[in-house]
Interface confidence: low
Amino acid sequence: QSSERRVVAHMPGDIIIGALFSVHHQPTVDKVHERKCGAVREQYGIQRVEAMLHTLERINSDPTLLPNITLGCEIRDSCWHSAVALEQSIEFIRDSLISSEEEEGLVRCVDGSSSSFRSKKPIVGVIGPGSSSVAIQVQNLLQLFNIPQIAYSATSMDLSDKTLFKYFMRVVPSDAQQARAMVDIVKRYNWTYVSAVHTEGNYGESGMEAFKDMSAKEGICIAHSYKIYSNAGEQSFDKLLKKLTSHLPKARVVACFCEGMTVRGLLMAMRRLGLAGEFLLLGSDGWADRYDVTDGYQREAVGGITIKLQSPDVKWFDDYYLKLRPETNHRNPWFQEFWQHRFQCRLEGFPQENSKYNKTCDSSLTLKTHHVQDSKMGFVINAIYSMAYGLHNMQMSLCPGYAGLCDAMKPIDGRKLLESLMKTNFTGVSGDMILFDENGDSPGRYEIMNFKEMGKDYFDYINVGSWDNGELKMDDDEVWSKKSNIIRSVCSEPCEKGQIKVIRKGEVSCCWTCTPCKENEYVFDEYTCKACQLGSWPTDDLTGCDLIPVQYLRWGDPEPDYKDDDDK
């Protein structure tokens, strides 16, 4: 899969929606210049392609939604990489430009005669892509042509800025919300000194920025902050891990505003460096409850606490997806490649026959084996439905009493569609209300997950809490079998009575040494000792001073008893 030839999935229709999914992994560092993508992806790729195709079938067969109008699509591969996604978006735009020129009769043949050739229908909107950095680049292009974009997992806070990203909307909340949720978890367990890691790129950078800002306001100190690319080499991850160990045993908690593959890189480095069990990873929704992050490295991931966007599995998608077979599924051009990759076998007689697999695929193979639904499936489907409802509302207002596309909707005006989309609200696939605020964002609801060893060599994610619009609920007993097991991540222990904190030059406010006040001093505040005035003495609890009662000697009082040093 290189830059020369890109595969596209098509589905015909009266209105065409574009989609960008990461069908393949991003190019490795050495392949970036060629834009040569990595291996095929199931959850983030193939499942999302199939979700788009099948959801459109459901919409088209629903008599109440866009009656007499068929929705089609054009799905392209973003490879979770800006350059590839931009290249693909230009293809969307090119189709739109040619189509609009046709509408205006501007397309003529070389000999001057008019053309009877009809090019592809324009793309009215785009679903995706998944990554925030990639979504920003794509939006920069799409908004020039008034093409609305609805994202299903791009959560960067920057995308809320409508002056910069006018045509961008999303069915997920902004990362400001999960940064808050992460800080609330850190606060809950009294972790005041944590290390921080984020994925280079917009998602990680803006998310970590928010986490650090909120942490500072809550008196939480960051031991050190590091950044790394998901596709960085082993040496880079090893180097990062070694830096993190330099903050042990104080900063045991590592807050990771990271893409899933960054977390995997960290886990792999922990294995190489034998650091399993030394850290507790607190991960953002890039990790969530993904098995492709932890597979093979479960021991290193144990104890991890992660944030997951609330999105239950979609049963009807599984009913459809699990029946798919390579010999009958021809509309998904990546399916045969995926099948071979998934089962590590060769599909004989298919053009994408891959010689790297020696074994021929058995006809009894089924997707039911080890099936895991994409954790963001509900959002992908909601994004597609949002586009359909937006178009439906637009049709109702522009073509009253008319079933189908009236002239007022030809061609579809992106500005009017955006207006209609922003007003859209409907019941989502999981029964929750889908609506958009003035920034095109959706409300924040998260599940808190914990990766645990459930039995010998059996590991899994369990739901241990939720964060809903500012309220954190956690089942502490599920995370920690007993209170004494709660990991400590503090730089300095509290000072004892009569001691003050002395913060060393250049140290953060969470790291101090405890120094006792002098004999005639009391603790004025946690950083200052003050001498009692003449004639007074510190109280027993050293919080203030008491006057020393004056005693006058009278005749007849016994003499004071002076002892020699030699007296025992």
Epitope: K242, L248, R271, R272, G274, L275, A276, R299
Partner: antibody
Amino acid sequence: QQQLEESGGGLVKPGGTLTLTCKASGIDFSGYYYMCWVRQAPGKGLEWIACVYTGDGGTYYASWAKGRFTISKTSSTTVTLQMTSLTAADTATYFCARGSGVGSYGYNLWGQGTLVTVSS
Amino acid sequence: DIVMTQTPASVEAAVGGTVTIKCQASESIYSNLAWYQQKPGQPPKLLIYRASNLESGVPSRFKGSGSGTEFTLTISDLECADAATYYCQGYYAITTTNAFGGGTEVVVK
């Protein structure tokens, strides 16, 4: 039953070269392990030499072994240890061992060892 | 490289008794320590990994503890079959290298 079997040991002259092979049976390296070599001089303690990660072929060496010893995964069931510039101090029983980490989880499967004698 | 110092070199105890073997690392190795039992003519057998985790099939009479630089292996209710040489193995993550202790010979009377 999972087993490791070392071969290739024997008598070699000082300055010579020898390649030891560790063959796994009942184990498929696609499960990703660390395959390591440990040696034990007669009547002495254990000495770690090197490990190879079967997932990507990454190698890890004791500082004294770098340059003279080369560990590699040669197939889905074999690992080799190539030893050059051998001296009498290299006389030992060489064990092949398997672990889940380079060292952090210990080695839970060992071969019976192969004896290497360096002598003129 | 990391250096592992094991004490004592030899220890004698009666059946039913308890033996304690200590292992000290020259640098902090966190919990990265394993204990092995080796009998003459046999390869080592893993007893404990990550300082305190009992390998499956190993009796609970074997107990590992410690972290950082100081580690201990305690064998209680000694049996004749426990007579062997015991080795600690430390793993230093910063240099990705291992080192074994010199070994402790346990004699059971």
